[in-house]
Each structure stands twice: as C-alpha cells, then as structure tokens.
C-alpha cells in the first residue's frame, strides 16, 4: 500500500511539474495586421482564443516573455497569400521573410534567433499565390527575455489561425 501511495505521489508530482511547464501558442490577430512592404514587427496576436493558448509565459506589447529559465523549442509558421479579388500586386518580385527575434531587457540587446523565407516571382497572370515559411529551433532562454516576430510584406499575410502563428515550449531546465 505504501509503495502504491508513493507511486501515486510520484505521478502527481510529475503531472504538476508537466502542468507547470511553460508553453505558448499564439495566433495572428487578423483585425490588426500592420501595412507596409518593408520589415515590420507583428505585435497583435491572440493568446486565448481558438487554437491559441498560453501557460506560465506572458504575452505583452506584442512580445512573448519568458518567465522561467530553460531550454525552449521556439517555432513560427507564416503564410503569405494573394488572390486577385483584392487587387493587383504592385510588384511581382517579392521577398517574403520571417525573423524570430530575442530581446534582452537586462543587457539591452536584440538577436535574430531564426529567419526563413525566399524571394518569389508572383506573376500577375495567376489568380492565386501562396507561400508558407516554417522555422523552429532549440534555444536557451532566461527569465525576462522577449520573443518577437518580424515579417516582410505584412499586407500579404494569411490571417487564419492555422496559417500564421508562433509559439514556444520549455523542454528542460538549465543545469
């Protein structure tokens, strides 16, 4: 019986540790996508509706803030699209990019952790164009550090929650 009690306590401890593991999955706020054809920061994301969720991390001022030191897996998926019903592209040669950036408040500095994308030729003869970028990586993050997303050509972003999103989850502690 004692062994069983010990075992269930162990399960509970494991479960609560897992439940305390920080994670976030943020989806684009389609009502507030900035305009521009140059690199812009995406600051409006959902954290509590649809697929979006957050736990033991903070979302503030367009940035995902780390609350616990640790090794995290960061990911971002950005979809760009254009359909002729919205008009014509002013230029057919496009650089479609995403940048995942880490900002440290303690030692004011900013680093691009990941970038992805391509130059594209989206011909005016086609009715529809689509391009998707997915980046992911394993990073040591400290409490207080902030993760943000920058993209080129935000007016071409696909605003669906299954298309444009980013997130993080803690994988292990820093030894």
């Amino acid at each position: 019986e004692k062994a069983m009690v010990d075992g269930s306590w162990l399960d509970l401890a494991k479960r609560s540790k897992l439940e305390a593991q920080p994670f976030a999955h943020l989806t684009i706020n389609a009502t507030d996508i900035p305009s521009g054809s140059h690199k812009v920061s995406l600051s409006s994301w959902y954290h509590d509706r649809g697929w979006a969720k957050i736990s033991n991390m903070t979302f503030s001022n367009g940035k995902l803030i780390v609350n616990q030191d640790g090794f995290y897996y960061l990911y971002a998926n950005i979809c760009f699209r254009h359909h002729e019903t919205s008009g014509d592209l002013a230029t057919e040669y496009l650089q479609l990019m995403v940048y995942v950036t880490k900002t440290s408040i303690k030692i004011p500095s900013s680093h691009t952790l990941m970038k992805g994308g391509s130059t594209k030729y989206w011909s005016g003869n086609s009715e529809f164009h689509f391009y998707s970028i997915n980046v992911g990586g394993f990073f040591k993050l400290r409490s207080g550090e902030e993760i943000s997303i920058e993209v080129s050509n935000p007016s071409l972003l696909d605003p669906d929650q299954d298309a444009t999103y980013f997130g993080a989850f803690k994988v292990r502690d820093i030894d």
Epitope: S37, T85, G87, D88, L89, A90, T91, S155, L156
Partner: antibody, heavy 126, light 103 residues
Amino acid sequence: QVQLVQSGAEVRKPGASVKVSCKASGYDFSNYAIHWVRQAPGQRLEWMGWINAGNGNTKFSQKFQGRITVTRDTAASTAYMELRSLRSEDTAVYYCARDSTNMVRGIIIAYYFDYWGQGTLVTVSS
Amino acid sequence: EIVMTQSPSSLSASVGDRVTITCRASQSISRYLNWYQLKPGKAPRLLIYGASSLQSGVPSRFSGSGSGAEFTLTISSLQPEDIATYYCQHTRAFGQGTKVEIK
C-alpha cells in the same frame, strides 16, 4: 489638396495615335499608382490599365494590350497614356484616377480610385 | 472575368426619398466593391469603398452594404445634388450604371 489635371480635348483620324497627360499635385506622386479608365458614349466605365508611379510597373486590360502605352515622369509628377491605331469606337472620355493604396504602406493596388482627373474627350473621326 | 450587373438602369424619385441601387457580381468578391458618382463634365467621385466604408467628405446619407456577390448603395434622403449616374466597381469591372433623376 490632391488634384489630377488632364490635358485638353483631342480630335484624331482613324489609325492615328493620341497621348493624354495627367498632372498630379498635392501628394507624393511616386507613392501611388495611376489608373486609366474611359467611358464611350452610352457605355459603362471601362478600365484600361495602371502604372505604379514609383517603379514604372504597368498592367493593361487584355482589350488594349499592344495598343496602349502608359508612362510617367516622376520629376513632373505626370502620367501619360498613349493609345495607338485609333478607331471610331475609341471615341470616349478618358480619365486618369489615383489608386488609394500608398505604396509605402502596402503593395496591393486595390482599385479604389480616390481621386480622378476631369476627363479628356478624344474624338476619332474621319 | 467577373461581370458586374446593376439594377435598375434608371430611376426617378422625389427629394427626401430613400433610394436603393443593387449591384451583383458574377461570383463572390468578398467585400471588394466600390461605388462612384458621375456627373456630366465633372470628375467621378468615390462614395463607398470596401462595400460599406464611406469615403472622406461624402455625406452620411450615402451608405453601402453587402458581401459575397450582392451589394447595395442607399441614399437615405435624396437631395437635388444627387442627380447623377452611379456605378459599382470591383477591380477591373464596372457595372453598367444607374441614372438617378428627380421626379
């Protein structure tokens, strides 16, 4: 205030060419596209083509492809539309119109014509 | 190629009347629809863009609604200066126009 001022009325014989100008003022000419639209007597408005005043990119209606040239002079803030091999059916009022999209903020030419020229009557008659 | 169809082609109404013009697209165009006013010898004027957004400087008696393939322009209280031909437009395609006259 934003203004588009077009050149005066023209009379041409069939087979000839005409070049209509559209002078812009009151905004940064290079940041917007200019469209050309015409209206023949008793007909609906008809889109002809656009030019991105910033980079000179153009797009034309299939109907006018090969007969139309649209250019711009950024220093003079002026767009030009030349139509060649004129026929009597080309008798119309020709308008230039500004696209509402500021190219600094976006790259989609949205076809919202927020300012128009006063129109240029082109008569094609033998 | 999308075709825009307006109805009626002309109408006559009294000052103060509510006037409604309909525009249909041959396929769904979301909310990418604009309305223009044309008066003879004058530059055309953008009234409504994006189906329902009122262009700056346009009187509030003009309003637009609809999405998909069916749209309407409404003049809530017709004024003498509203005598004109009204056109709907989606990108490269225009409707055939509706001529509005005063009774």
